[in-house]
């Protein structure tokens, strides 16, 4: 940056190089150039010469004043007009930043996405600070009293292997930058209560032609959690409102759910699950489309990158999806 140049004098900022956005600031430039009594001192912001609010303080020093400074970052430098010098002589430069102190982090949430091997902790950081803000996540075992700290600039993934202090923990987040520091409330967690099951995925749909046509949705998860509650939502693509069906699910086999739908309409389906009685949901699965036939039975299938999900049954149309065992996204 601009701060790496060789200086013939110095430049400083009051109240500080990093300051609260909207403040009035003064930038001072003091020349120390051999054999030069500066005729004039100039200020540049991001390479553009400033014309106003410059005050000469003495023979070697000048001040540039800004009212209500709102730029997150700026590169400042100053120059001198020396007698007998054709060009301006560079005095010094400095990068300045404006922003806000951090808000109190809230909505601290920790979940373990099944198969990830990590506990993922997130929080609402509040308003944008514009300046470098670091977060320290504190994880304290309620059984051993041992505390671990993790430094991050956003969320944190903590290996479950490093959580050796039993099952119960307190988690809180400290936010800090050059303008201030705040601390969240403490969140109490039990590792067994924060697991989000492996992604539930809709793999296939078929409509069976009967007196009342019936659509069967095939869906599955490779979770090892035995008691899982799921929701499947569906709607005609032309509708705004979702219909929701609830299931107590046992993923020891691929699930088949029956729907009685209107003929010749394109529907969209999504599914999500949670460990029964627990707080956190999976994100909704990717959209799965199925058009009901007028009369002829129809099968819709997803061909997954993981062959596990190929059923070997005849399909009328193929759409591609991707199965991961590591669910990420909204946790509801």
């Amino acid at each position: 940056g601009i701060t790496n140049i060789n200086c013939s004098g110095h430049i400083w900022v009051e109240p500080a190089t990093i300051f609260k956005m909207g403040m009035n600031i003064s930038i001072y430039c003091q020349a120390a150039i051999k054999n030069c009594q500066p005729r004039k001192l100039h200020f540049y912001k991001n390479g553009i010469k400033e014309r106003f609010q410059i005050t000469r303080i003495n023979k070697t020093t000048a001040r540039l004043w800004y009212k209500n400074f709102l730029e997150p970052h700026a590169s400042m430098y100053c120059t001198a007009e020396c007698p007998k010098h054709f060009q301006e002589t560079l005095i010094c430069g400095k990068d300045i930043s404006s922003g806000y102190p951090p808000d109190i982090p809230d909505e601290v949430t920790c979940v373990i996405y099944e198969y990830s091997g990590n506990m993922t902790c997130t929080w609402n950081a509040g308003k944008l600070t514009y300046i470098d803000t670091k977060y320290v996540v504190h994880v304290k075992s309620l059984e051993t009293e041992e505390e671990q700290q993790y430094l991050t600039s956003s969320y944190i993934n903590i290996s479950t292997d490093s959580l050796q202090g039993g099952k119960k923990y307190l988690v809180w987040v400290q936010a800090a930058n050059a303008l201030g520091m705040e601390e969240s409330k403490q969140l109490q967690i039990h590792l067994d209560d924060i697991v989000i099951p492996s992604a539930a995925v809709i793999s296939r749909a078929e409509t069976i032609n009967a007196t009342v046509p019936k659509t069967i949705i095939y869906w599955d998860s490779q979770t090892t959690i035995e008691k899982v509650s799921c929701e499947m939502r569906y709607k005609a693509t032309t509708n705004q409102t979702w219909n929701v069906k609830e299931f107590d699910t046992n993923f020891t086999y691929v699930q088949q759910s029956e729907f009685y739908l209107e003929p010749n309409i394109k529907y969209v389906f999504q599914v999500r699950c949670q460990e029964t009685g627990k707080r956190y949901w999976q994100p909704w699965s990717s959209l799965f489309f199925h058009k009901t036939p007028e009369t002829v039975p129809q099968v819709t299938s997803k061909a997954f990158q993981h062959d596990t999900w190929n059923s070997g049954l005849t399909v009328a149309s193929i759409s591609t999806g991707h199965l991961t065992s590591d669910n990420r996204g909204d946790i509801g």
């Epitope: 990830s116 091997g117 479950t160 998860s221 490779q222 979770t223 090892t224 993923f251 086999y253």
Partner: antibody
Framework: DVQLQESGPDLVKPSQSLSLTCTVT?????????WHWIRQFPGNKLEWMGY???????NYSPSLRSRLSITRDTSKNQFFLQLNSVTTEDTATYYC???????????WGQGTTLTVSS | DIVMTQSHKFMSTSVGDRVSLTCKAS??????VAWYQQKPGQPPKLLIY???YRYTGVPDRFTGSGSGTDFTFTIISVQAEDLAVYYC?????????FGSGTKLEIK
């Protein structure tokens, strides 16, 4: 690539305890899945014995529960079978496996053959 | 406990033929049945789970069907390398149980 490898004695005397080790490479046993022991008797009959979940919880076959223990050493990425008071009826090839969710056994070790004899 | 019965100990077939093996559960297991192939000196290898879902990398000549208590495993066109013992297993509930196996012999 996930690999499982069983190890243990070839021969155990009746009434003694049997200890077998399954060493897993390519996946951490604490990151997920159920990790099982299955045995195959000389006549080829397969018997499920029990499993340990990634969280450390266990589930045993009712017929073996009184003398079976499955444990693990997470630092070595190993899980273990201990079968007490063995008899000649426990002569078998012992496999460790990883289950596909709550469904079938997707990864198997090569098996270790155990003979119970005095 | 659920008992899985494979009524045929042996099945004889020719290369290129279609062959079907059956398995019966002593009680309802929905579609929670897997099929394995075992060759001499090797561990069982997963082919089908949840009655009809082929496992990763399994050739599509292997198919499965059935639900409830009756299940069928079919090899659409038998190859010489398919000579093996085939086991069914219920993964509906613990204790998990296996069938006694059907040995596929090539004529």
């Amino acid at each position: 690539d996930v690999q499982l490898q069983e190890s243990g004695p070839d021969l155990v005397k009746p009434s003694q305890s049997l200890s077998l080790t399954c060493t897993v490479t390519g996946y951490s046993i604490t990151s997920g899945y159920n990790w099982h022991w299955i045995r195959q008797f000389p006549g080829n009959k397969l018997e499920w014995m029990g499993y340990i979940h990634s969280s450390g919880t266990t589930n045993y076959s009712p017929s073996l529960r009184s003398r079976l223990s499955i444990t693990r050493d997470t630092s070595k990425n190993q899980f273990f079978l201990q079968l007490n008071s063995v008899t000649t009826e426990d002569t078998a090839t012992y496999y460790c496996t990883r289950q596909l969710g709550l469904k079938a056994m997707e990864y198997w070790g090569q098996g270790t053959t155990l003979t119970v004899s005095s | 406990d659920i008992v899985m019965t494979q009524s045929h100990k042996f099945m004889s077939t020719s290369v290129g033929d279609r062959v079907s093996l059956t398995c019966k559960a002593s009680q309802e297991v929905r579609t929670a049945v897997a099929w394995y192939q075992q060759k001499p000196g090797q561990p069982p290898k997963l082919l089908i789970y949840s009655a009809s879902y082929r496992y990763t990398g399994v050739p599509d000549r292997f198919t499965g069907s059935g639900s409830g208590t009756d299940f069928t495993f079919t090899i659409i066109s038998v190859q010489a390398e398919d000579l093996a013992v085939y086991y069914c297993q219920q993964h509906y509930t613990t204790p998990y149980s296996f069938g006694s196996g059907t040995k596929l012999e090539i004529k």
